[in-house]
């Protein structure tokens, strides 16, 4: 297993609709054809897997149908979008990248993106 640098923004504010997008960039030392991207959430020192996708270079990322993540790839960059976020989902979202094929296997873990999520203010009751 060899180490690889992964860069991601430090702080992102999700939209009022609970959507957050950020780029995860990795310094690929070779010509990988198969890449696995995993998003981990760290909150109160607990780490959980949010979503994961394996893709062939040049193809779209394919997450599971019920995943809250979507993404696109371009070269050594992965543009990740996480949706359905609520205030309680505020936390550090860490991008983990694995170059699966061809060997050697490379692993890179970013420092994390702190995603702040603000629940929208409830609309005042109005009579029409």
């Amino acid at each position: 297993c060899k180490a690889m640098h992964v860069a991601q923004p430090a702080v992102v504010l999700a939209s009022s609709r609970g959507i957050a997008s950020f780029v995860c960039e990795y310094a690929s030392p070779g010509k990988a054809t198969e890449v696995r991207v995993t998003v981990l959430r760290q909150a109160d020192s607990q780490v959980t897997e949010v979503c994961a996708a394996t893709y062939m270079m040049g193809n779209e990322l394919t997450f599971l149908d019920d995943s809250i993540c979507t993404g696109t790839s371009s070269g050594n960059q992965v543009n990740l979008t996480i949706q359905g976020l609520r205030a309680m989902d505020t936390g550090l979202y860490i991008c983990k990248v694995e170059l699966m094929y061809p060997p050697p296997y490379y692993l890179g873990i970013g420092n994390g993106t702190q995603i702040y999520v603000i629940d929208p203010e409830p609309c005042p009751d109005s009579d029409f």
Partner: antibody
Framework: QVQLVQSGAEVKKPGASVKVSCKAS????????ISWVRQAPGQGLEWMGW????????NYAQKLQGRVTMTTDTSTSTAYMELRSLRSDDTAVYYC??????????WGQGTLVTVSS | EIVLTQSPGTLSLSPGERATLSCRAS???????LAWYQQKPGQAPRLLIY???SRATGIPDRFSGSGSGTDFTLTISRLEPEDFAVYYC?????????FGQGTKVEIK
């Protein structure tokens, strides 16, 4: 080193608007956020809101909603805070601060805004 | 809105003494999102502690933070002359982000 430098003091009349700038250096501007905090004379710190320099999304304190606008110019690594319909109780020192993973650091030197007729 | 109440309002102590400052939240705050700042007259606030207990870069180890839930504490083990200032706690786990009203540490 990481630094935030704010624009100079302003004197405004009630009802006018003020726009304070905050120029960042020493770090990747779009990787962080900028928060604005004000402090009336002899009073404590009041959080006004913040902007994510990465995507431009904003979160404002409810009491200022509709009067405040926070923006960034990523080409010059500068954040702006505009406050409209100024009142005498808006007289304060206005600070910008970098929003990190779980901290505000560093802070700008502050900009005194005086609202007086 | 989470209200942070700091006590005491003023702490009168001598250099070399221990200072214990309290910050109580009206609702539970994740300790990841509780910070302490120091402010001296005419200066901008300075980050001391983040994540309730982690010291910021360059902050002397006489400053320490602790607590969880609704009760947080900033301790200055031995007051130095430059430590006399106003201290604020802040939470940013729940919007709106809020500050306590401050505790002034003054020379006795």
């Amino acid at each position: 080193q990481v630094q935030l430098v704010q624009s100079g003091a302003e004197v405004k009349k009630p009802g006018a608007s003020v726009k304070v700038s905050c120029k960042a250096s020493g770090y990747t501007f779009t990787s962080y956020g900028i928060s604005w905090v004000r402090q009336a004379p002899g009073q404590g710190l009041e959080w006004m809101g913040w902007i994510s320099a990465y995507n431009g999304n904003t979160n404002y304190a409810q009491k200022l909603q509709g009067r405040v606008t926070m923006t960034t110019d990523t080409s010059t690594s500068t954040a702006y805070m505009e406050l409209r319909s100024l009142r005498s109780d808006d007289t304060a020192v206005y600070y910008c601060a970098r929003v990190g993973v779980n901290w505000f650091d560093p802070w700008g030197q502050g900009t005194l805004v005086t609202v007086s007729s | 809105e989470i209200v942070l109440t700091q006590s005491p309002g003023t702490l009168s102590l001598s250099p070399g003494e221990r200072a214990t400052l309290s910050c109580r939240a009206s609702q539970s705050v994740s300790s990841s999102y509780l910070a302490w700042y120091q402010q001296k007259p005419g200066q901008a606030p300075r980050l001391l502690i983040y994540g309730a207990s982690s010291r910021a870069t360059g902050i002397p180890d006489r400053f320490s933070g602790s607590g969880s839930g609704t009760d947080f504490t900033l301790t200055i083990s031995r007051l130095e002359p430059e430590d006399f200032a106003v201290y604020y706690c802040q939470q940013y786990g729940s919007s709106p982000w809020t500050f306590g009203q401050g505790t002034k540490v003054e020379i006795k």
